[in-house]
C-alpha cells in the first residue's frame, strides 16, 4: 500500500507568504516543488502518523537582545519519510527550513547513514530571504541510483552551537535480485549427495529461488533465498545454475560445472633420462587427475629376458615430482617399464610400456690365484694370476688394475698399474728395497673396476738377499696369503 | 509423520462434476507443491499436474487441460482436484502426491476412487 | 513426451531370489525413481534419484543405471516384496511413469 505523504502539525510555518520559484505554502507537500527535468516522482512514504505532534530535534527558543520577544524554536519542516525507487533512476528530494533573520552564517550538511557527505555530491542549498525569516531549502539529487545509494539521509544545521536536525528520508532503490552468493564448480565422488548454496537480495524482498540442472529446473516450487540444494548424487558431469526472481524480475547466476571424480588416465611419454649398471632414471608426463589429486605413483618393472621368471617389481614414489630413480636393477640386462598413479578414487592403468637396458657392471669378483716373488736379477717383481670368472653383465673385459704398496720404516706408497684384458702376469720395478710390497689386483671392464683380490705381500731384501719362493693367495678362498722369504 | 488425507469414494454420473479434497499434515504446507496422480482400474500411473502451494498456480500436463482444476485453501492445508463434465473414461483413482525437488512424489495420500457411471 | 518401458511387464519369482526389473527410456533423462504399490493400496516411494533409498525402505532394494538405462535391484526377495513396481523420471517435463512390472510369486 502507498501512504500519502502528509505534513504534520507544525510548530512554525514553511514560508511566511509567497516564494519566488512557485513554491507555495505551508500545507503543500514537497513532492510539488519544482525538481530537475527528467525526474520522475518516486513512490513516497510519511515517516511518522498524521496528527502527532513534531518531536524531532529542534533549537530551544531565545529572548533576542533588542526586547523581550520570544522566538519560535527552529525546526526542519516534515519532507517525505520513504522513497522508493528503481536502479538507474533520478531522484531529487530536500529537507527546508525557516531560521530568523538575527541568526548568521547558517549551513546545512547532509549526511547519509551517519556520515557526512562530502565532495562530489549534487546538494544545492537555495535561500529566500523576507522580513523576518529566510526559507532555506537543501536539495540533494542523485542520477541513475545505484543500489548503493541505499539508506537513511538527513539535514543538519548548526545555529549559535546548537545542532538541528532533519527526520531522516530513506531511499530505498529497488532492482533485479543480486547475488551475494551462487554456487561453486566442485569435484564430487559419483552417487554421492553433495550442497549447492544460493544466495540474492533485493529489494524488492522476498528473493525466490529456482534451481536449475543441466537446463531442467530442480524444484518447481522456488524457495525462499538463501536456499541449499541437496544433490542426491551424480552419474556424470552436470552444469547448475540458480535463477533468482523478485518483483522486479530475474536474474540468472553462474553455470557451475559439477565434475565426478574418476580413476586418472594413465601417464604418458614415459622417458629414459639416464641409465647406469645397477639403476635407470625415468621420468613421466601425468595423465588427466580425474578431478582428484593425485596421490602418488607406481613404478613397475620387468625384465625382459626369457629365462627370468617373469615377476614384476613395484617401486612406489610420490606423484611428484614426475622422476624416479629406480635402483636395485642388474647390470646389462633389458627392462620394460611401466608407470600408474593414484588418486583418492584408485588407480590409473599402466602407462605404455618403454623398454630400458642398464649398461656393464663392475666386475664382481676378483682375479684368482695371485701369486708374488721377486727377481733379484731384474730387481722386479713378478705377478701372475688367473682371469677371474666374471658374470656376462659385468660385459667385456678390458684390463686389469694392480695396486702396489710399498712399506719401509715409516714409508709408505701405494702405485697403481694397468694392463691388458690378454695379460695374466706383470711385472713391477722393485721400488724400495728392504721394504714389504703388498698386492692387490682388479678386473677392469667398461662398467668399472671390479673388487680388489686380497692382499699378498712379500718382503724386499737388501741388495745381496736371494728369494725365489713365490707368494700366492690359495685359488678358491680369502685365506691370508703365506708369505715365503 | 507426514500424512496425506483424501476425501472418500465419489459415484457420479456423466457431465456432473465432483471435487476431491486432499488434506495435509506434520509439514509446512506451502513449502512443497502438491501433485494430482490417475491410475484407471488395471492401469498405470499418469502425471496430471500440481499446484504451487505458496502460489496458488497450477500447472496441467497436456491430457489434463480443459475440465481439470487444481486449487488450494492453504488455511486448512488442503489441496483440491475439480473434475467438471465427468465422462466415463474419467473413472480412475486420484491421488494427491507431495511434490519434492526433483519430480520426486515423496508422500501420496490413499487414494479417491471416482466413478463415472449413468 | 518421454517414454519409459520397463521389462519385464510380469515378473514371477521366488521368496529369497534376486531379481533385477529395467526401465528404458526414450531419451537421456537426470534421474530415475521408483516406486512400490501393493494392491488396493497408494503408491509407496522406493528409490530416489536413481540410487538413493527412500526413508525406510530395507537395504535389499537399489537402484543404478544413467542416461537411458536404469535398474531396480532386489537382492533377495521377502514375501512382502510382491507388488508392482514403477519407474519415474526426471529431467524433461512432464514426469512420466513407466507401465508397471508386476512380480507375483512363483
Known amino acids: 500500500a502507498i501512504t500519502e505523504a502528509r505534513e504534520e502539525a507544525k510548530p512554525y510555518p514553511l514560508f511566511p507568504g509567497p516564494l519566488p520559484g512557485s513554491l507555495q505554502t505551508d500545507h503543500t507537500s514537497l513532492l510539488s516543488l519544482p525538481h530537475t527535468s527528467g525526474y520522475q516522482p518516486a513512490l513516497m512514504f510519511s515517516p511518522t502518523q498524521p496528527g502527532r505532534p513534531y518531536t524531532g530535534n529542534v533549537a530551544i527558543p531565545r529572548v533576542t537582545s533588542a526586547g523581550s520577544k520570544l522566538l519560535p524554536p527552529l525546526a526542519f519542516k516534515h519532507t517525505v519519510g520513504h522513497i522508493i525507487l528503481s536502479e538507474h533512476k533520478d531522484v531529487k528530494f530536500n529537507c527546508s527550513i525557516s531560521v530568523p533573520n538575527i541568526y548568521q552564517d547558517t549551513t546545512i550538511s547532509w549526511w547519509k547513514d551517519g556520515k557526512e557527505l562530502l565532495g562530489a555530491h549534487h546538494a544545492i542549498t537555495q535561500f529566500y530571504p523576507d522580513d523576518e525569516v529566510t526559507a532555506i531549502i537543501a536539495s540533494f539529487s542523485i542520477t541513475s541510483v545505484q543500489r548503493s545509494d541505499n539508506g537513511s539521509y538527513i539535514c543538519k544545521m548548526k545555529i549559535n552551537n546548537e545542532e538541528i536536525v532533519s527526520d531522516p528520508i530513506y531511499i530505498e532503490v529497488q532492482g533485479l535480485p543480486h547475488f551475494t552468493k551462487q554456487p561453486e564448480s566442485m569435484n564430487v565422488t559419483r552417487n554421492t549427495a553433495f550442497n549447492l548454496t544460493c544466495q540474492a537480495v533485493g529489494p524488492p524482498e522476498p528473493v525466490n529461488i529456482f534451481w536449475v540442472q543441466n537446463s531442467s529446473r530442480v524444484n518447481e516450487q522456488p524457495e525462499k533465498s538463501p536456499s541449499v540444494l541437496t544433490v542426491p548424487g551424480l552419474t556424470e558431469m552436470a552444469v547448475f545454475s540458480c535463477e533468482a526472481h523478485n518483483d522486479k524480475g530475474l536474474t540468472v547466476s553462474k553455470g557451475v560445472q559439477i565434475n565426478i571424480k574418476a580413476i586418472p588416465s594413465p601417464p604418458t611419454e614415459v622417458s629414459i633420462h639416464n641409465s647406469t649398471a645397477h639403476s635407470i632414471l625415468i621420468s613421466w608426463v601425468p595423465g588427466f587427475d580425474g578431478y582428484s589429486p593425485f596421490r602418488n605413483c607406481s613404478v613397475q618393472v620387468k625384465e625382459v629376458d626369457p629365462l627370468s621368471n617373469g615377476s614384476v617389481m613395484i617401486f612406489n614414489t610420490s606423484a611428484s615430482p614426475h622422476m624416479y630413480q629406480i635402483k636395485q636393477l642388474q647390470a646389462l640386462a633389458n627392462y620394460s617399464i611401466g608407470v600408474s598413479c593414484m588418486n583418492e578414487i584408485g588407480w590409473s592403468a599402466v602407462s605404455p610400456w618403454i623398454l630400458a637396458s642398464t649398461t656393464e657392471g663392475a666386475p664382481s669378483v676378483a682375479p684368482l690365484n695371485v701369486t708374488v716373488f721377486l727377481n733379484e736379477s731384474r730387481d722386479n717383481v713378478d705377478i701372475r694370476w688367473m682371469k677371474p670368472l666374471t658374470k656376462r653383465q659385468a660385459g667385456e673385459l678390458v684390463g686389469y688394475r694392480i695396486s702396489h704398496v710399498w712399506q719401509s720404516a715409516g714409508i709408505s706408497k701405494e702405485l697403481l698399474e694397468e694392463v691388458g684384458q690378454n695379460n695374466s702376469r706383470a711385472q713391477i720395478s722393485v721400488q724400495v728395497h728392504n721394504a714389504t710390497c703388498t698386492v692387490r689386483i682388479a678386473a677392469v671392464t667398461k662398467g668399472g673396476v671390479g673388487p680388489f683380490s686380497d692382499p699378498v705381500k712379500i718382503f724386499i731384501p737388501a741388495h745381496g738377499w736371494v728369494d725365489h719362493a713365490p707368494s700366492s693367495t690359495p685359488a678358491p678362498g680369502n685365506a691370508d696369503p703365506v708369505l715365503i722369504i | 509423520q507426514v500424512q496425506l488425507v483424501q476425501s472418500g469414494s465419489e459415484l457420479k454420473k456423466p457431465g456432473a462434476s465432483v471435487k476431491v479434497s486432499c488434506k495435509a499434515s506434520?509439514?509446512?504446507?506451502?513449502?512443497?507443491?502438491m501433485s494430482w496422480v490417475r491410475q484407471a482400474p488395471g492401469q498405470g500411473l499418469e502425471w496430471m499436474g500440481w499446484?504451487?502451494?505458496?502460489?496458488?498456480?497450477?500447472t496441467y500436463t497436456d491430457d489434463f487441460k480443459g475440465r481439470f482444476v487444481f486449487s488450494l485453501d492453504t488455511s486448512v492445508s488442503t489441496a483440491y482436484l475439480q473434475i467438471s463434465s465427468l465422462k466415463a473414461e474419467d473413472t480412475a483413482v486420484y491421488y494427491c502426491a507431495r511434490y519434492t525437488n526433483y519430480g520426486v512424489f515423496d508422500y501420496w495420500g490413499q487414494g479417491t476412487l471416482v466413478t463415472v457411471s449413468s | 513426451d518421454i517414454q519409459l518401458t520397463q521389462s519385464p511387464s510380469f515378473l514371477s519369482a521366488s521368496v529369497g531370489d534376486r531379481v533385477t526389473i529395467t526401465c528404458r527410456a526414450s531419451?537421456?533423462?537426470?534421474?530415475m525413481h521408483w516406486y512400490q504399490q501393493e494392491p488396493g493400496k497408494a503408491p509407496k516411494l522406493l528409490i530416489y534419484?536413481?540410487?538413493n533409498l527412500a526413508q525406510g525402505v530395507p537395504s535389499r532394494f537399489s537402484g543404478s543405471g544413467s542416461g537411458t538405462e536404469f535398474t531396480l535391484t532386489i537382492s533377495s526377495l521377502q514375501p512382502e516384496d510382491f507388488a508392482t513396481y514403477y519407474c519415474?523420471?526426471?529431467?524433461?517435463?512432464?514426469?512420466?511413469f513407466g507401465q508397471g512390472t508386476k512380480l507375483e510369486i512363483k
Open positions: 531419451s537421456s533423462v537426470g534421474y
Open positions: 519415474q523420471q526426471w529431467g524433461s517435463l512432464p514426469f512420466t
Open positions: 534419484a536413481t540410487s
Open positions: 506434520s509439514y509446512t504446507f506451502t513449502t512443497y507443491g
Open positions: 499446484i504451487n502451494t505458496a502460489s496458488g498456480v497450477p
